[in-house]
Interface confidence: low
């Protein structure tokens, strides 16, 4: 039979007021015969918390059934934790003896301290949208945690960020603490579908960090590129001109066609095509009547995107004699 070891795996146990605390203790041997007791503190003044053999302990329950012959788990649960319960708890094996049982071996002890979980991190982005290549700031806040030690990380699409500043308040002793971090993120043109994540790790979370997220789609504006093209074929007396608005975000877009400076058609973008990167494309068609047109017609496609200054693209219409004379649906 191997020598008895009393195993208390946790050095520190953080508990919350009003909750139940589980103090773990396992033994490596059933020998020697005798009970296991729990104490808070050491020495003559130690407080008996639980006695396997006898006594009434209304707030204490055992994790395993200690009446079972080969039980090796002497863990206990203490309910309705109060601040008065903090201290170091020892699991102690006694050897059956006369007139009293004799202390045989003690566990290393588990310190019980009050802990509080951090609140779910809240990530806030910039108030206004910004175009790619610019830097935007995101803030992350979490509150109400204890002890003070906490780890905060930032990620963009799974890649850890390094440009951030973090503060934990207050700096002195407190019942609970708060953390605030600001990360600077350079926007890329493909960031419509990107996400920033604030990850908070704390001892009370048992290795399962809390995460707050923000979508860069809320922070980015990708301005459109314009291309105005005259279609080669005529439709009756009309020439078809297209304005291709490409790679823009968000969707909000108004388009105006002008002919030699005179506004002739206004449109609001609808039935957009979505690109893989989350940006949008849209094409507007404009029919120009060329039956009595001069050769110096200038068409302008003007786009106002997301309330920004309008951008425009011009096209000098090329109407050849052949086009004037021959309709695309004419038969040879």
């Amino acid at each position: 039979e191997e020598e008895l070891q009393m195993i208390q795996p946790e050095k520190l146990l953080l508990v919350t007021v009003g909750k139940t605390a589980t103090l773990h203790c396992t033994v490596t041997s059933l020998l020697p015969v005798g009970p296991v007791l729990w104490f808070r503190g050491v020495g003559p003044g130690r407080e008996l918390i639980y006695n396997q053999k006898e006594g009434h302990f209304p707030r204490v329950t055992t994790v395993s059934d200690l009446t079972k012959r080969n039980n090796m788990d002497f863990s206990i649960r203490i309910s309705s934790i109060t601040p008065a319960d903090v201290g170091t708890y020892y699991c102690v094996k006694f050897r059956k003896g006369s007139p009293d049982d004799v202390e045989f071996k003690s566990g290393p002890g588990t310190e019980m301290a009050l802990g509080a979980k951090p609140s779910a991190p809240v990530v806030l982005g910039p108030a206004a949208r910004t175009t790619p290549e610019h830097t935007v700031s995101f803030t992350c806040e979490s509150h109400g945690f204890s002890p003070r030690d906490i780890t905060l990380k930032w990620f963009k699409n799974g890649n850890e960020l390094s440009d951030f500043q973090t503060n934990v308040d207050p700096t002195g002793q407190s019942v609970a603490y708060s953390i605030r971090s600001t990360a600077r993120v350079v926007l890329d043109p493909w960031d419509v579908r990107s996400q920033v994540i604030c990850e908070v790790a704390h001892v009370t979370l048992q290795g399962d960090p809390l995460r707050g997220t923000a979508n860069l789609s809320e922070a980015i504006r990708v301005p459109p590129t314009l291309e105005v093209t005259q279609q080669p074929m005529r439709v009756g007396n009309q020439v078809n001109v297209t304005c291709q608005v490409r790679k823009f975000y968000p969707q909000s877009l108004q388009l105006t066609w002008s002919e030699n400076g005179n506004v002739c058609q206004r449109e609001t973008a609808s039935t957009l095509t979505e690109n893989k990167d989350g940006t949008y494309n849209w094409t507007s068609w404009f029919l120009v009547n060329i039956s009595d047109q001069r050769d110096d017609v200038v068409l302008t496609c003007q786009v106002k995107h997301d309330g920004q200054l309008a951008v425009s693209k011009r096209l000098a219409l090329e109407v050849t004699v052949h086009q004037k004379d021959q309709s695309s649906d004419a038969t040879p």
Epitope: E1, E2, S64, D65, T67, K68, R69, N70, N71
Partner: antibody, heavy 118, light 107 residues
Framework: EVQLVESGGGLVQPGGSLRLSCAAS????????MHWVRQAPGKGLEWVSA???????YYTGSVKGRFTISRENAKNSLYLQMNSLRAADTAVYYC????????????WGQGTMVTVSS | DIQMTQSPSSLSASVGDRVTITCRAS??????AAWFQQKPGKAPKSLIY???SLHSGVPSKFSGSGSGTDFTLTISSLQPEDFATYYC?????????FGQGTKLEIK
């Protein structure tokens, strides 16, 4: 389904040897204390031997030094090597699983008959 | 070794009867007493452990009680399938030992 199936019984002469096997299915044999219990014809039950999860072994007085209990975790099997057999060892031998916490017998095999006779 | 003494050795009863079998340990065994049922030509079946806990699948007409040295098995309303031999066992220390058995027969 949790099951124990014994094999290896048969007729053997006094002084001879037999090896009983018990194949476990539906659970990991090494996680439990395992036992052999026997029943002579027309008689009651008699505990024979046990092997603990740590490999510790126990025997009833009449078989000490003659019987050896063992297990092979890879095959999920329990064995009882019986040497120097006597007529008094004639019995049905049962393989039994002990409970997780208190070693109370919960699962029994169907048994295998061992007859020691010249 | 701890001796387990069962009584009676045999018992005749009728369908519907309530019967009690007792078992006495030669020394205190806490509550580490178990009960088994065995029918002719079959392996024993586990009924009760730690004196009063029923194994899964065992009907509630079976009940056990006791601690220390004296234990009882009670069958509240006998059915034809309950006529068999019943054994008690101590498993507090090796060697584990069984009672000599109680044969329950139809009257």
């Amino acid at each position: 389904e949790v099951q124990l199936v014994e094999s290896g019984g048969g007729l053997v002469q006094p002084g001879g040897s037999l090896r009983l096997s018990c194949a476990a299915s539906g659970f990991t044999l090494s996680s439990y204390d395992m036992h052999w219990v026997r029943q002579a014809p027309g008689k009651g039950l008699e505990w024979v031997s046990a092997i603990g999860t740590a490999g510790d072994t126990y025997y009833t007085g009449s078989v000490k030094g003659r019987f050896t209990i063992s297990r092979e975790n890879a095959k999920n099997s329990l064995y009882l090597q019986m040497n120097s057999l006597r007529a008094a060892d004639t019995a049905v031998y049962y393989c039994v699983r002990g409970g997780v916490w208190d070693d109370a017998f919960d699962i029994w095999g169907q048994g295998t008959m061992v007859t020691v006779s010249s | 070794d701890i001796q387990m003494t069962q009584s009676p050795s045999s018992l005749s009863a009728s369908v519907g009867d309530r019967v009690t079998i007792t078992c006495r340990a030669s020394q205190g065994i806490n509550n580490y007493a178990a009960w088994f049922q065995q029918k002719p030509g079959k392996a024993p079946k586990s009924l009760i452990y730690t004196a009063s806990s029923l194994h899964s699948g065992v009907p509630s007409k079976f009940s056990g009680s006791g601690s220390g040295t004296d234990f009882t098995l009670t069958i509240s309303s006998l059915q034809p399938e309950d006529f068999a031999t019943y054994y008690c066992q101590q498993y507090v220390s090796y060697p584990y030992t069984f009672g000599q058995g109680t044969k329950l027969e139809i009257k």
